[in-house]
């Protein structure tokens, strides 16, 4: 992470993407340590904007405003040089979010993908954004940036992610920026969880009292495996959300979760997946599909006693 020979390394914590009102620490790492340093903001003229102030270890900026967005550099203290200061550091871009209406983020073909596949994340808005930025939660690298394409009063950008592997799973958000203010970003899109399946052994899925039930009869779907999964996810074909439950160790050394579906009203095809707490967005292979059939008088919906997860939240730990 060190800079070149006489070049400090400027970094931001916790992130270079900071919401309005948030705080960020700028750290200038120079010659195996944090020495005194000066900060510059590249606003046309390359002059210290901090009134010649000298900082030690880090400079905390905040509550940040749109004016804080931009490119920063630092110079480390070099007492025995001609100028007393090092060469300028790497440029560090600080992006301030929350300045325009949020864009929308969609996954094509969908947010549940097999390892090795490619997904297109489309960020779009009716605000005429010049650039779109895609950011994965928990990643300190700068967001990916694309120029927005404008068609029929909508600006959009397609981010291609893949081939998918565990490190690319997670919660994504996108932002937009308007011309002349490239680092003053919009509010974030609603979060979108990208889940990668097919990494571990498939669990088995069964129905109690059985896969064919009378209308009104209570049905429970059990997902189990010899693998020590922490969480099981149950999905129903044609439904956008999944249900999840904590796995419980059983006396026969399997790990199981029982999903009560309540009184049967109509059937459907179900699948379940297992995942580990450490990697909540990386799932097992799908169980074999289980077709639940209801005999009698079907109605249009099946109540959900287990609370469905929202479009996002899959990649959060289940506490």
């Amino acid at each position: 992470l060190m800079g070149g020979q006489d070049k400090p390394f400027l970094s931001a914590r916790p992130s270079t993407v900071v919401p309005r009102g948030g705080h960020v620490a700028l750290q200038c790492h120079y010659r195996r340590g944090f020495n005194n340093f000066m900060l510059y903001k590249e606003d046309r003229s390359h002059v210290p904007i901090f009134h010649g102030r000298i900082f030690q270890e880090s400079f905390i900026m905040g509550p940040v405003t749109p004016a804080h967005a931009g490119t920063y550099r630092c110079r480390g203290s070099r007492p025995h040089s001609l100028t007393g200061w090092s060469a300028p550091s790497n440029p560090l871009v600080i992006m301030v979010t929350g300045n325009h209406r949020k864009p929308s983020l969609l996954a094509h073909p969908g947010p549940l993908l097999k390892s090795g596949e490619t997904v297109i994340l489309q960020c779009w808005s009716d605000v005429m954004f010049e650039h779109f930025f895609l950011h994965r939660e928990g990643i300190s690298e700068d967001p990916s940036r694309l120029v927005g394409q404008i068609h029929d009063g909508v600006s959009k950008a397609n981010f291609s992610i893949g081939p998918l592997m565990p490190v690319l799973a997670g919660t994504y958000r996108c932002y937009g920026s308007v011309p002349h203010s490239p680092y003053q970003l919009s509010a974030p899109s609603d979060p979108l969880d990208i889940v990668i399946t097919g990494l571990y052994e498939k669990p088995s899925l069964s129905a109690q009292p059985g896969p064919t039930v009378q209308a009104g009869e209570n049905v429970t779907l059990s997902c189990s495996s010899w693998s020590s999964y922490d969480i099981y996810h149950l999905s129903r074909e044609g439904e956008a959300h999944e249900r999840r439950l904590r796995a419980v160790p059983k006396v026969n050394r399997t790990f199981q979760a029982d999903f009560p579906l309540g009184p049967a009203t109509h059937g459907g095809t179900y699948r379940c997946f297992g995942s580990f707490r450490a990697l909540p967005c990386v799932w097992s292979n799908s169980s074999d599909p289980l077709l639940v059939s209801v005999t009698g008088n079907p109605s249009s919906s099946w109540p959900s006693p287990t609370e469905p997860s929202s479009k996002s939240g899959i990649c959060r730990h289940l506490h």
């Epitope: 900071v18 919401p19 309005r20 009102g21 948030g22 705080h23 880090s58 905390i60 509550p63």
Partner: antibody, heavy 120, light 107 residues
Framework: QVQLQQSGAEVKKPGASVKMSCKAS????????MHWVRQAPGQGLEWIGY????????ENNRKFKDKTTLTADTSTSTAYMELSSLRSEDTAVYYC?????????????WGQGTTLTVSS | DIQMTQSPSSLSASVGDRVTITCRAS??????LAWYQQKQGKAPQLLVY???NLADGVPSRFSGSGSGTQYTLTINSLQPEDFATYYC?????????FGGGTKLEIK
């Protein structure tokens, strides 16, 4: 020691305006942002907005954007909040609070609160 | 805007008990979280900042933990003066929203 002294209780009629104050002492007024928080009777706390007394920069919770005006007088180390077009729903205790320093700062000092009653 | 979900909304306990209050953020707030105690008719008082740091003068029976989206305030060995309402608040971008509060009552 740090103190935030707020102005006294106010009773106003619907449609009127009110300007409450928060006088800071015991620290450099321009080095910290001043925030305002409201608490309706029997309810929780709501962040209204803040002012940076050094620059005059203000930011408001969207919910209160057309309701509040935040100002500061650096010569007297006093922050002000004006509430306009008062309605009975604005009846609440209003607190000023100083945002501390550091990377993860909290509201480290609070005023004692100004009670506003809006009634016809 | 970031939502803060605090639970439980009320809690009955006895002197000497250990109680836990949780606060869940709708997104990662990077430990930008404070806990406050408020007694009837008084201004809130800071207990914990940066999720885990105890404010000056706060008794060591109070402790904060958590990271990411999930945070906890724990009070060990409740004292009579601890019966009050507790609020969490995030600082990761405006608006700095508060949790709904937890009223801690004597059993």
């Amino acid at each position: 020691q740090v103190q935030l002294q707020q102005s006294g209780a106010e009773v106003k009629k619907p449609g009127a305006s009110v300007k409450m104050s928060c006088k800071a002492s015991g620290y450099t007024f321009t080095s910290y942002t001043m925030h305002w928080v409201r608490q309706a009777p029997g309810q929780g706390l709501e962040w209204i907005g803040y002012i940076n007394p050094s620059s005059g920069y203000t930011e408001n919770n969207r919910k209160f954007k057309d309701k509040t005006t935040l100002t500061a007088d650096t010569s007297t180390s006093t922050a002000y909040m004006e509430l306009s077009s008062l309605r009975s729903e604005d009846t609440a205790v209003y607190y000023c609070a100083r945002l501390g320093k550091g990377l993860l700062p909290p509201f480290d000092y609070w005023g004692q609160g100004t009670t506003l009653t809006v009634s016809s | 805007d970031i939502q803060m979900t605090q639970s439980p909304s009320s809690l009955s306990a006895s002197v000497g008990d250990r109680v836990t209050i949780t606060c869940r953020a709708s997104e990662n707030i990077y430990s930008n979280l404070a806990w406050y105690q408020q007694k009837q008719g008084k201004a809130p008082q800071l207990l914990v900042y940066a999720a885990t740091n105890l404010a000056d003068g706060v008794p060591s029976r109070f402790s904060g933990s958590g990271s990411g989206t999930q945070y906890t305030l724990t009070i060990n060995s409740l004292q009579p003066e601890d019966f009050a309402t507790y609020y969490c608040q995030h600082f990761w971008g405006t608006p700095y929203t508060f949790g709904g509060g937890t009223k801690l009552e004597i059993k």
